[in-house]
């Protein structure tokens, strides 16, 4: 194929790929009609002057997991018809100015995880098609100024993984097209008013795992096309009224891991077309009546790990379309007998983890479709009869770690788990709490020693241990992990992870369908 | 139907107690909060606090703090408002009231009338 | 505590008019806002809750707007029976606290 060098191969679809360790300089002599060139994983330490002269047609080029620490300027002359460069996980501190000059169809430029101390406005300023920057994992601490003044076609730029303090709400003024825009992991305090207001075409605005304490109440107010917003792991305390007010298009918010200890009214909406909501790991004491409203189409609301000890009747007014709750590891002793009523959708609902003492027996009433219940963990003794009599779809009824008072009261309650057990499935089963005669045996075998009450309830039929969800869609777009599960760590939907890890610890968010932002 | 049925008016000297006692009916009784509301002569309404007659926890009026005492009776379906250190301006109207199907109130008792005078 | 400041205090109008009664709370209380008219002797009665959604057997002539700050209650066609006391009241944080109520009267 018009000359291989001996440690690459070469396809007949012109792509060439060189990788090894006993590689330390650009093979030669490249195919001169190679369109595709990967040099990874070899231990080239510099790029000299026009390693790439006589492949003028090349349109890719990945030089990625290298040990390159050095590049001449004239390294990539002549490639005027690149349109894709990766120099990714180098060890790459300094970039040459004019280092870009000529290459006038780069649309993708990949400098991530290297060791960048800077960046300066003259090294992108000859880029004036590109699309893609990415500059994740580096060690930038500041932006100049005019650094992506002459990016106008830029549709998306990641920042990520830096050590940025602070940006000027200059920076990104003149990419107008720009629709994704990621801040993630670094050291942001606090973010101007103004600083995104010339992204009128963004989408996803990733700024989770940083510092910001407070957010402008006119911040987004420019974004009306944003449709993802990741404000996880932060400092933030309160949330203006007006922050979120003109986001229509917004379908997925991350608040989890921030120090909110209130939501206050009206604050989300109108979003119509908001799907997820992610509010664990806060400081939320209560929520008032109408709170979630304006959030019509909602499917996931993540409330876990708060303090939240009141919910008034009203709170989920307005959630018709909510499939997942979930409100475990809060202080919660008492819910109001209508504090479900809108519900009607529910399919799963996480209780674990709080104080409730009783449940009013219409608690699900409307709530026909919930096929998971978690209320292990509370300080339920006995439940009212038929409670989830006419629910039946339910196939995961979590009771176990409860104080259940065995006398004959529980009869009722026993019969039915009897005729139920497939629903509670066989990790761990209630056992009794008292009398102490019988403390620590299975309330399902349990014998009372006093005349059985006629109690009729309705033939279900067997239903697998755990819920079967049908036509759930891989990862990234939801993660399907058993209600017992949690991911170990949070992750975005654009992360690279191939594998997510699951753990078996009950303490967290007991939802069917896990996934953070 | 949901009703609140009262007890009848009271009159009380200065540093006395009173208290007030609310039957319902019409639907089950633990399962939904109770609040207390009360109305001095020529003044505006005044919240005090409620009650979740499932577990017997309450929340109370910073105001009212330390002064009342809201209770429950299961097995009756009644609730109660004890007020204690009685002064002229607790002269009011206390009504009882549980919410609907949000934090406003639904339905209301017939009010009791306590009148405090030396 | 968030005040509810409620004017007029007191209005007189004759049947067939349309009355307005504003509120205005001392802090955003959302769309957590309650009407309630009381007549002499009787225990309020719930007209309007979450601002603007009127009470199941509430006549259509009443009808709340606002969210914020502020609300209005609008009789558009007072009838003799309408002549009473009307509160508004805020839920959305404790302690829960009422306006001073507007009085409405017969010309």
């Known amino acids: 194929y018009h000359g291989c060098p001996s440690e690459c191969t070469c396809s007949r679809a012109s792509q060439v790929e060189c990788t090894g360790a006993r590689i330390v300089a650009v093979p030669t002599p490249l195919p001169w009609n190679a369109m595709s060139l990967q040099i990874l994983n070899t231990h080239i330490t510099e790029l000299n002057e026009s390693p790439f002269l006589n492949i003028s047609a090349l349109i890719a080029l990945r030089i990625e997991k290298n040990e390159l620490s050095r590049i001449t300027p004239g390294a990539f002359r002549n490639l005027g018809s690149l349109r894709y460069l990766s120099l990714a996980n180098n060890k790459l501190q300094v970039l040459p100015i004019g280092l870009f000059q000529g290459l006038d169809s780069l649309e993708s430029l990949l400098l991530s995880s290297n060791q960048l101390l800077q960046i300066q406005p003259a090294h992108f300023s000859q880029c004036s098609n590109l699309k893609e920057l990415q500059l994740h994992g580096n060690h930038l601490e500041y932006i100049p100024d005019g650094a992506f003044d002459h990016l106008v076609g830029l549709t998306k730029l990641n920042l990520g993984k830096n050590s940025l303090t602070h940006i000027s709400p200059r920076v990104f003024q003149h990419l107008g097209n720009l629709q994704v825009l990621r801040l993630y992991e670094n050291r942001l305090t606090d973010i101007p008013m103004g600083t995104f207001d010339g992204l009128v075409n963004l989408q996803e605005l990733a700024l989770q795992q940083n510092q910001i304490g407070l957010l402008s109440p006119g911040l987004f107010h420019n974004n009306h096309n944003l449709q993802r917003l990741y404000l996880s792991n932060n400092h933030i305390s309160q949330l203006p009224p007006s922050v979120f007010m003109q986001l229509p298009q917004l379908n997925r918010l991350t608040l989890f891991g921030n120090s909110l200890k209130e939501l206050s009214p009206g604050i989300f909406g109108p979003m119509p077309n908001l799907r997820e909501l992610w509010l664990y790991d806060n400081h939320i004491s209560s929520l008032p009546d109408n709170v979630f409203s304006n959030l019509r189409q909602l499917q996931v609301l993540i409330l876990s790990r708060n303090q939240i000890s009141f919910i008034s009747p009203g709170a989920f007014n307005g959630l018709t379309e909510l499939r997942e709750l979930s409100l475990h590891t809060n202080a919660l002793q008492d819910l109001d007998g209508n504090v479900f009523r809108m519900l009607a959708n529910l399919q799963n609902i996480s209780l674990q983890n709080n104080r409730l003492r009783q449940l009013p027996g219409n608690i699900f009433a409307n709530v026909n479709g919930l096929m998971a219940i978690q209320l292990q963990n509370n300080q339920l003794e006995n439940l009212p009869l038929g409670i989830f009599d006419h629910l039946g779809k339910l196939c995961e009824l979590r009771l176990y770690d409860n104080p259940w008072r065995c006398d004959s009261d529980i009869l009722p309650l026993r019969n039915w788990l009897l005729l139920n057990q497939p629903r509670l499935g066989t990790d761990t089963v209630p056992v009794c709490f008292s009398p102490a005669n019988v403390r620590g045996q299975s309330l399902i075998i349990i014998n009372v020693n006093v005349a059985v009450p006629s109690v009729h309830v309705p033939e279900v039929p067997s239903y697998p241990e755990t819920p079967w969800y049908p036509d759930t869609p891989s990862y990234p777009d939801t993660t399907s992990v058993s209600s017992t599960t949690e991911l170990t760590s949070p992750v975005e939907d654009y992360t690279d992870l191939t594998t997510i890890q699951v753990t078996d610890d009950r303490s967290v968010w007991g939802m069917t369908q896990a996934q953070s932002g | 139907q949901v009703q609140l049925v009262q007890s009848g008016a009271e009159v009380k000297k200065p540093g006395a107690s009173v208290k007030v006692s609310c039957k319902a009916s019409g639907y089950t009784f633990t399962d939904y909060y109770i609040n207390w509301v009360r109305q001095a002569p020529g003044q505006r309404l005044e919240w005090m606090g409620w009650?979740?007659?499932?577990?017997?926890?309450?929340k109370y009026s910073q105001k009212f703090q330390g002064r009342v005492t809201i209770t429950r009776d299961t097995s009756a379906s009644t609730a109660y408002m004890e007020l204690s250190s009685l002064r002229s301006e607790d002269t009011a109207v206390y009504y009882c009231?549980?919410?609907?199907?949000?934090?406003?109130?639904?339905?209301w008792g017939q009010g009791t009338l306590v009148t405090v005078s030396s | 505590d968030i005040q509810m400041t409620q004017s007029p205090s007191s209005l007189s109008a004759s049947v067939g008019d349309r009355v307005t009664i504003t509120c205005k709370a001392s802090q955003n209380v959302g769309i957590n806002v309650a009407w309630y008219q009381q007549k002499p002797g009787k225990a309020p009665k719930l007209l309007i809750y979450?601002?603007?959604y009127r009470s199941s057997g509430v006549p259509s002539r009443f009808s709340g707007s606002g969210s914020g700050t502020d609300f209005t209650l609008t009789i558009s066609s007072l009838q003799p029976e309408d002549f009473a006391t009307y509160y508004c009241q805020q839920y959305n944080s404790f302690p829960y606290t009422f306006g001073g109520g507007t009085k409405v009267e017969i010309k």
């Open positions: 009231a549980r919410w609907g199907y949000g934090a406003y109130f639904t339905y």
């Open positions: 979450s601002a603007s």
């Open positions: 009650i979740y007659p499932g577990s017997g926890n309450t």
